[in-house]
């Protein structure tokens, strides 16, 4: 019995068959963040819950210090949603001293760090201008796509302003990846 | 020939191999909803088309009475998009009696119901403040993530206001899940 | 050793087992578009990068002339994000001649073309009214869902106005599909 008998007849099997339940997978959920001062052009990374509630990591996919560690080379689907909330936004007016931070945009970036490569790679970016004339506003940014990742790669989620991230519910802000 | 010979050499296969085309999958599309009285803090569930047009269920994934029934334990990717549409929204003004429904927010929740557990679990939430100063507005909320589900779990999509859901096209509002 | 011995005992394997790394997959990223005259009710297709940077096609999934070609029948997860950017939008005012394009909505459609079928099928649509009172605005529309596709089907991404698409970064605007 040859391995290729399981594959479609028109094509050779180049990779070993493997059980789906054995693939690296993670779904991480939001936790309370340190509400740091918003610095232009510097996007802080979020940290995450990895084992309580809906969160899990399995099959050698590990979470440590804001990073998801990729344990095996392959094609992964990577996704995140960040829900932001804020006060009335800037809408191009002059910012007044002492008033709470009024952003003119919100951004989420899923970033790949490869130790052998000096610069992080931005895999996905969701960016939105915010011009809300009402008082409080809130909205999610969702991202998801497939990437070829290498064993040892690290993934993180960066945001334009950590103090605007809604950390109150695990279903509002999350981050995940799974080997296809 | 041993099953583990198909797995990467560094790891034992713990789950049986199985054909991908045999996995539970569903993509449901929007249908006209029964208008319900908008109740504060109670989000009605949408019902769905499960066999016409782009919609399908397969491999023991069944749809019944607003619920997708999970036929087999495992990790599922679950997703939904709901397109909302409405008239000028509130923007923090006082709501006037008799005026058309002017929401100050729109919300989608994907909810898991487990018969043995009294409270439903909110898996995913997309929530957005609405402050549109023009006349008619419309916008989608998209959600998707991976969850460990158990055989017998039921999934539904709840919305903040069923009367604002755009039911006109199957590509605008949909709900799906597939076993990874 | 019979193939079905790898499947859960309650169910027959109807499809051949196959290595996951052998499945058709593509992730395409944005490139500078040819500006086209904005035609009402006719949404132009985007063209894409298919091999540089984060972009790739593999296992007989090919990209040609704005289309992703489906090489094998099966269930695919298909996704796209388009980031739009523009000047102050219409907000229901009368559009003035000679003023920069001020859209009142932005739309993304993932479309399937089947040669044997005269009309394209809209698989996914994300559409949003735009009423931004500030000056410049930008925002993404994300779409993703699972569809049963046939060998020979072609997928494309259409937008309401190609001149508003942000083509500056590969992580902002993208299109992908993979066989489940």
């Amino acid at each position: 019995l040859k391995g290729q008998e399981f594959a479609p007849s028109h094509q050779q099997v180049y990779a070993p068959l493997r059980a789906d339940g054995d693939k690296p997978r993670a779904h991480l959920t939001v936790v309370r963040q340190t509400p740091t001062q918003h610095l232009k052009n510097q996007f802080p990374a979020l940290h995450w819950e990895h084992e309580l509630g809906l969160a899990f990591t399995k099959n050698r996919m590990n979470y440590t210090n804001k990073f998801l560690l990729i344990p095996e080379s392959g094609d992964y689907f990577v996704y995140s949603q960040v829900t932001f909330r804020g006060m009335t936004s800037e809408c191009s007016e002059i910012r007044q001293a002492g008033r709470p931070n009024k952003p003119d945009s919100i951004t989420v970036v899923i970033t790949k760090v490869t130790d052998s490569y000096p610069e992080p790679t931005q895999l996905l970016m969701g960016t939105k201008s915010v011009c809300e004339v009402g008082s409080n506003w809130f909205q999610p940014i969702y991202l998801g796509a497939m990437f070829s990742l290498q064993e040892g790669d690290k993934l993180m989620v960066n945001v334009s302003d950590i103090s605007l991230v809604d950390y109150t519910k695990e279903d509002k802000t999350f981050f995940g990846a799974f080997l296809l | 020939l041993k099953g583990q010979e198909f797995a990467p050499s560094h790891q034992q296969v713990y789950a049986p191999l199985r054909a991908d085309g045999d996995k539970p999958r569903a993509h449901l599309t929007v249908v006209r909803q029964t208008p319900t009285q908008h109740l504060k803090n109670q989000f009605p569930a949408l019902h769905w088309e499960h066999e016409l047009g782009l919609a399908f269920t397969k491999n023991r994934m069944n749809y019944t009475n607003k619920f997708l029934l999970i036929p087999e334990s495992g990790d599922y990717f679950v997703y939904s998009q709901v397109t909302f549409r409405g008239m000028t929204s509130e923007c923090s003004e006082i709501r006037q009696a008799g005026r058309p429904n002017k929401p100050d927010s729109i919300t989608v929740v994907i909810t898991k119901v487990t018969d043995s557990y009294p409270e439903p679990t909110q898996l995913l939430m997309g929530t957005k403040s609405v402050c549109e100063v023009g006349s008619n507005w419309f916008q989608p909320i998209y959600l998707g993530a991976m969850f460990s589900l158990q055989e017998g779990d039921k999934l539904m999509v709840n919305v903040s206001d069923i009367s604002l859901v755009d039911y006109t096209k199957e590509d605008k509002t949909f709900f799906g899940a597939f076993l990874l | 050793l019979k193939g079905q011995e790898f499947a859960p005992s309650h169910q027959q394997v109807y499809a051949p087992l196959r290595a996951d790394g052998d499945k058709p997959r593509a992730h395409l990223t944005v490139v500078r578009q040819t500006p086209t005259q904005h035609l009402k009710n006719q949404f132009p297709a985007l063209h894409w990068e298919h091999e540089l940077g984060l972009a790739f096609t593999k296992n007989r999934m090919n990209y040609t002339n704005k289309f992703l070609l489906i090489p094998e029948s099966g269930d695919y997860f298909v996704y796209s994000q388009v980031t739009f950017r523009g000047m102050t939008s219409e907000c229901s005012e009368i559009r003035q001649a000679g003023r920069p394009n001020k859209p009142d909505s932005i739309t993304v459609v993932i479309t399937k073309v089947t040669d044997s079928y005269p009309e394209p099928t809209q698989l996914l649509m994300g559409t949003k009214s735009v009423c931004e009172v500030g000056s410049n605005w930008f925002q993404p529309i994300y779409l993703g869902a699972m569809f049963s596709l046939q060998e020979g089907d072609k997928l494309m991404v259409n937008v309401s106005d190609i001149s508003l698409v942000d083509y500056t970064k590969e992580d902002k605007t993208f299109f992908g599909a993979f066989l489940l």
Epitope: P35, Q37, G86, P100 | - | -
Partner: antibody
Framework: QVQLQQWGAGLLKPSETLSLTCDVY????????WNWIRQPPGKGLEWIGE???????NYNPSLKSRVTISVDTSKNQFSLKLSSVTAADTAVYYC??????????????WGQGTLVTVSS | EIVLTQSPGTLSLSPGERVTLSCRAS???????LAWYQQRAGQAPRLLIY???SRATGIPDRFSGSGSGTDFTLTISRLEPEDFAVYYC????????FGQGTRLEIK
């Protein structure tokens, strides 16, 4: 040394609005959560809500409909308003700094407390 | 919301004795979000333990904390006269909650 000093009216009639302010001395205002906590006489502690330097609030669900917390970063102060008070709102009200670094969070500095009595 | 239940409600002990206070959560709590506070009569609470087991600055080493998941304990190895007070556990999730307190009184 960080110090939290709170002030506001101590005696209210039912249906009035409680108003307290907490001044923060000797530390950065950003990077922390600024909280209000109360303790009815002879009872335990109840968290009311919090605000950060961006003005983002998070309230106890049981009090949410009546609570407003605001911030003025230029004065390094934050304030609590609790509307439609009743005798059940009689308590010592504390302001406190919420410290979060990495994934560790706790209340590290507290105000001296203000006894607010609601009586007709 | 996460409910924290402390036991016992009151303890009567003598100086020099060892005491263990219990705090049980209605659902799993991140250890790093679990803190213990001491409140003496007429004073504001004072942080003793954070992250379930780390002593706050200036807290004597007779105080120690342990536990994970839903069960946490505060131990005082040798009671000093100034330790007689009320002790609260607290979780700092998205909606912080306190236990109802354990009163430690002199026998």
């Amino acid at each position: 040394q960080v110090q939290l000093q709170q002030w506001g009216a101590g005696l209210l009639k039912p249906s009035e609005t409680l108003s307290l302010t907490c001044d923060v001395y000797g530390g950065s205002f950003s990077g922390y959560y600024w909280n209000w906590i109360r303790q009815p006489p002879g009872k335990g502690l109840e968290w009311i809500g919090e605000i950060n330097h961006s003005g983002i609030t998070n309230y106890n669900p049981s009090l949410k409909s009546r609570v407003t917390i605001s911030v003025d970063t230029s004065k390094n102060q934050f304030s609590l308003k609790l509307s439609s008070v009743t005798a059940a709102d009689t308590a010592v009200y504390y302001c406190a700094r919420g410290y979060c670094r990495s994934t560790t969070c706790y209340f590290d500095y507290w105000g001296q407390g203000t006894l607010v009595t609601v009586s007709s | 919301e996460i409910v924290l239940t402390q036991s016992p409600g009151t303890l009567s002990l003598s100086p020099g004795e060892r005491v263990t206070l219990s705090c049980r959560a209605s659902q799993s709590v991140r250890s790093s979000y679990l803190a213990w506070y001491q409140q003496r009569a007429g004073q504001a609470p004072r942080l003793l333990i954070y992250g379930a087991s780390s002593r706050a600055t200036g807290i004597p080493d007779r105080f120690s904390g342990s536990g994970s998941g839903t069960d946490f304990t505060l131990t005082i190895s040798r009671l000093e006269p100034e330790d007689f007070a009320v002790y609260y556990c607290q979780q700092y999730g998205s909606s912080p909650t306190f236990g109802q307190g354990t009163r430690l009184e002199i026998k």
